[in-house]
Interface confidence: low
């Protein structure tokens, strides 16, 4: 059975996959997959290091640790729903059927909506998707773009709508109103 | 389109520690695959770095040998090599180069933009 893993939406997956190398620079080669690691190699392959050096990526994939110690954890860059799915982490130890195979599973969850303040006055309720991205470094918060406005007519319905949601206990919890007039 | 500026070459001892800078003209560097190579006396140009736009490294380990590490600093458009216990051999001009490319072999990217070079010497 697969370890499971969660992101939201833009934020970055990690995949932690580790070995001891048997001296420093005695590298295995790794590969990582999309799917869960079949008999030999990996399928739909995103990123492999062999022997000295990483050898082939693509582009939203990256080591962020040093893989020269064993560390060939996976960061995925702003992840979609699209990247949800069995990753495979395969350390290719020499030797007829050695090799190490991790199958890992990534739950993509969408970002949570967050609320912004509105003028008293205005008519317009817009609620900019805000999210932290968590990593080593300090948190980010990056604006991914607004949600439709809500124009007059379409408030009750929306009221009606956020009512028994999740989205409503959000707004609520944060203490955000929508006022009319 | 993107322009290289190397600097940070000079003269040094056997031993001794350099590090090398790559200034990108350009609001797009952090989409360039960046990287190092050098051309030694009487050697082909040859890889020595590179870094992706993530950060992803790569080191050619036949010579670097845990003694040279490449970084970016993204908000300063700039890549940068630095050079540990330097040896004779590693007398040669240094030149950065960057490439759009998003996926493949670091080493053997498409390298599309190249710096003039730096001339880094190393006395015994």
């Known amino acids: 059975s697969e370890v499971e893993y969660r992101a939201e939406v833009g934020q970055n997956a990690y995949l932690p996959c580790f070995y001891t190398p048997a001296a420093p620079g005695n590298l295995v080669p790794v590969c990582w997959g999309k799917g869960a690691c079949p008999v030999f190699e990996c399928g739909n392959v995103v990123l492999r290091t062999d022997e000295r050096d990483v050898n082939y990526w693509t582009s939203r994939y990256w080591l962020n640790g040093d893989f020269r110690k064993g560390d060939v954890s996976l960061t995925i860059e702003n992840v979609t729903l699209a990247d949800s799915g069995i990753y495979c982490c395969r350390i290719q130890i020499p030797g007829i059927m050695n090799d190490e195979k991790f199958n890992l599973k990534l739950v993509i969850k969408p970002a949570k909506v967050t609320p912004a303040p509105t003028r008293q006055r205005d008519f317009t309720a817009a609620f900019p998707r805000m999210l932290t991205t968590r990593g080593h470094g300090p948190a980010e918060t990056q604006t991914l773009g607004s949600l439709p406005d809500i124009n007059l007519t379409q408030i009750s319905t929306l009221a009606n709508e956020l009512r028994d949601s999740r989205l409503a206990n959000d707004l609520r919890d944060s203490g955000a109103t929508i006022r009319i007039g | 389109q993107v322009q290289l500026q190397e600097s940070g070459g000079g003269l040094v001892q056997a031993g001794g520690s350099l590090s090398l800078s790559c200034a990108a003209s350009?609001?797009?560097?952090?989409?360039?695959?960046m990287a190092w190579f050098r051309q030694t006396p009487g050697k082909e140009r040859e890889f020595v770095a590179a870094?992706?736009?993530?950060?992803?490294?790569?080191l050619n380990e036949d010579f670097v040998k845990g003694r040279f590490t490449i970084s970016r600093d993204n908000a300063k458009n700039t890549v940068y090599l630095q050079m540990n216990d330097l040896k004779t051999d590693d007398t040669g001009v240094y030149s950065c180069?960057?490439?759009?490319?998003?996926?493949?072999?670091?080493?053997?990217?498409?390298?599309?933009?190249w710096g003039q070079g730096t001339q880094v010497t190393v006395s015994s």
């Open positions: 180069a960057a490439s759009l490319q998003s996926g493949g072999s670091l080493r053997y990217a498409k390298y599309d933009y």
């Open positions: 350009g609001r797009t560097f952090k989409n360039y695959l």
């Open positions: 870094i992706t736009q993530l950060g992803t490294r790569s």
